[in-house]
């Protein structure tokens, strides 16, 4: 079974401590080889994927993952119960909602079962690793002859998210962007009725409930304005 897990790169906001146990030996043994870094992302606080680069191992190795929460009621060591695979080799672990405790220090340990002393431990702040789902149900309302208001919904606690709105007209190549706080609405005060506008939004778990660096995917775009224009004779649906 080949499972492809798409996760953003980078883990800037994690606090990571690495502990590598090696055998005292003059020659380089397999236990001195560093284990790959584990990257965890919590998707909308519904599930968490902790993945590693399995191809960095010198030979195909089914590394095992254990986890626990530091200094908490959940400090019992747990085995991964749902591995993710890449070309039949373990490359990650998926944890379900009930196993996620955002505000306790998450400790994850990767181990080579053939060399039990070859292990690495990282400590992660999960509230900084949340990636919300893309905003949904974008709607546009005309507040006045030249003013538009964009609204959207998120499948998460609204006060925990900040947003980024981008918009452009048909002949713009670049986007104009505007940050929006937890209120999830955006007003464009001056709209040219002769132009067609495209809007899209993404969200981030920041700053009230966490300090995540990674944004959600972009929403489906929504359009406003004339269906055809003299310069750009292409038809659009109201919502892509």
């Amino acid at each position: 079974l080949n499972t492809t897990i798409l996760t953003p790169n980078g883990n800037e906001d994690t606090t990571a401590d690495f502990f590598l146990t090696t055998m005292p030996t003059d020659s380089l043994s397999v236990s001195t080889l560093p284990l790959p870094e584990v990257q965890c992302f919590v998707f909308n606080v519904e599930y968490m994927n902790c993945t590693w680069n399995s191809s960095s191992e010198p030979q195909p190795t089914n590394l095992t993952l254990h986890y626990w929460y530091k200094n908490s009621d959940n400090d019992k060591v747990q085995k991964c119960s749902h591995y993710l695979f890449s070309e039949e080799i373990t490359s990650g672990c998926q944890l379900q909602k009930k196993e996620i405790h955002l505000y306790q220090t998450f400790v994850v340990q990767l181990q080579d079962p053939r060399e039990p002393r070859r292990q690495a431990t990282q400590m992660l702040k999960l509230q900084n690793l949340v990636i919300p789902w893309a905003p949904e149900n974008l709607t546009l309302h005309k507040l006045s002859e030249s003013q538009l208001e964009l609204n959207w919904n998120n499948r998460f606690l609204n006060h925990c998210l900040e947003h980024l709105v981008q918009y452009r007209t048909d002949w713009d190549h670049s986007w104009t962007e505007q940050s929006v706080d937890y209120r999830h609405k955006f007003s464009l005060p001056s709209v040219d009725g002769q132009k067609r506008y495209t809007f899209r939004v993404r969200s981030r778990f920041n700053p009230l409930c966490g300090s995540a660096q990674h944004w959600s995917e972009w929403s489906h775009p929504i359009h406003w304005g004339s269906n055809t224009s003299k310069e750009n004779p292409f038809l659009f649906a109201l919502e892509a």
């Epitope: 798409l6 048909d170 670049s174 986007w175 750009n232 659009f236 892509a240």
Partner: antibody
Framework: QVQLVESGGGVVQPGRSLRLSCAAS????????MHWVRQAPGKGLEWVAG????????YYADSVKDRFTISRDNSKNTLFLQMNSLRAEDTAMYYC?????????????WGPGTLVTVSS | DIQLTQSPSFLSASVGDRVTITCWAS??????LAWYQQKPGKAPTLLIY???TLQSGVPSRFSGSGSGTEFTLTISSLQPEDFASYYC?????????FGGGTKVEIK
């Protein structure tokens, strides 16, 4: 890693047609706008055409309008440039380029190019 | 259409020199400008976008500045691998346009 590979170039007579392809891999092709840029021998870069991520809008340089058509097949991760009524001045190296997902949308990845020579 | 004029077209310099290339836009484009480097026989690579934002992996000796109609690309200390052609591109509106290019040669 992102990879773009153009193909379909060659020698063609004036007035004839040619179809270029650009095979994309290493990224989610259906999420990104794509472009064709050309460079005549010993000359500078010239933007030719661009297409939005879903194909809903297409844009062209005046020099190729009504002769060239940009299209894409998101199921096959492939970008196309159909070139009709070719002229000697269309002789160039043709590059496909991917937009970066930032507000400014620069071209962050380019293919190695495919050479089109229009000559009788 | 927005025209971009690059100056100079050719530039001879030595390793270690500070090099400045200028790009003028025929109308205001705010900071919607990118710079690319191209080596002979190769595809261009992105150096700078948003007039001054360094693309990931690009050495810090490259910098960009400007807004509106005048923009500059500066190489603070020219290295052997920097001898190449450089192009500006406006990213504001269609049709997209490039400057005519600047070829940086060894003196």
């Amino acid at each position: 890693q992102v990879q773009l590979v153009e193909s379909g170039g060659g020698v063609v007579q004036p007035g004839r047609s040619l179809r270029l392809s650009c095979a994309a891999s290493g990224f989610n092709f259906r999420n990104f706008g794509m472009h064709w840029v050309r460079q005549a021998p010993g000359k500078g870069l010239e933007w030719v055409a661009g297409i939005l991520y879903d194909g809903s809008s297409k844009y062209y340089a005046d020099s190729v309008k009504d002769r060239f058509t940009i299209s894409r097949d998101n199921s096959k991760n492939t970008l196309f440039l159909q070139m009709n009524s070719l002229r000697a001045e269309d002789t160039a190296m043709y590059y496909c380029a991917k937009e970066e997902d930032t507000a400014m949308v620069p071209f962050d990845s380019w293919g190695p190019g495919t050479l089109v020579t229009v000559s009788s | 259409d927005i025209q971009l004029t690059q100056s100079p077209s050719f530039l001879s310099a030595s390793v270690g020199d500070r090099v400045t290339i200028t790009c003028w836009a025929s109308q205001g484009i705010s900071s919607y400008l990118a710079w690319y480097q191209q080596k002979p026989g190769k595809a261009p690579t992105l150096l700078i976008y948003a007039a001054s934002t360094l693309q990931s992996g690009v050495p810090s000796r490259f910098s960009g500045s400007g807004s509106g109609t005048e923009f500059t690309l500066t190489i603070s200390s020219l290295q052997p691998e920097d001898f190449a052609s450089y192009y500006c591109q406006q990213l504001k509106s269609y049709p997209l346009t490039f400057g005519g290019g600047t070829k940086v040669e060894i003196k």
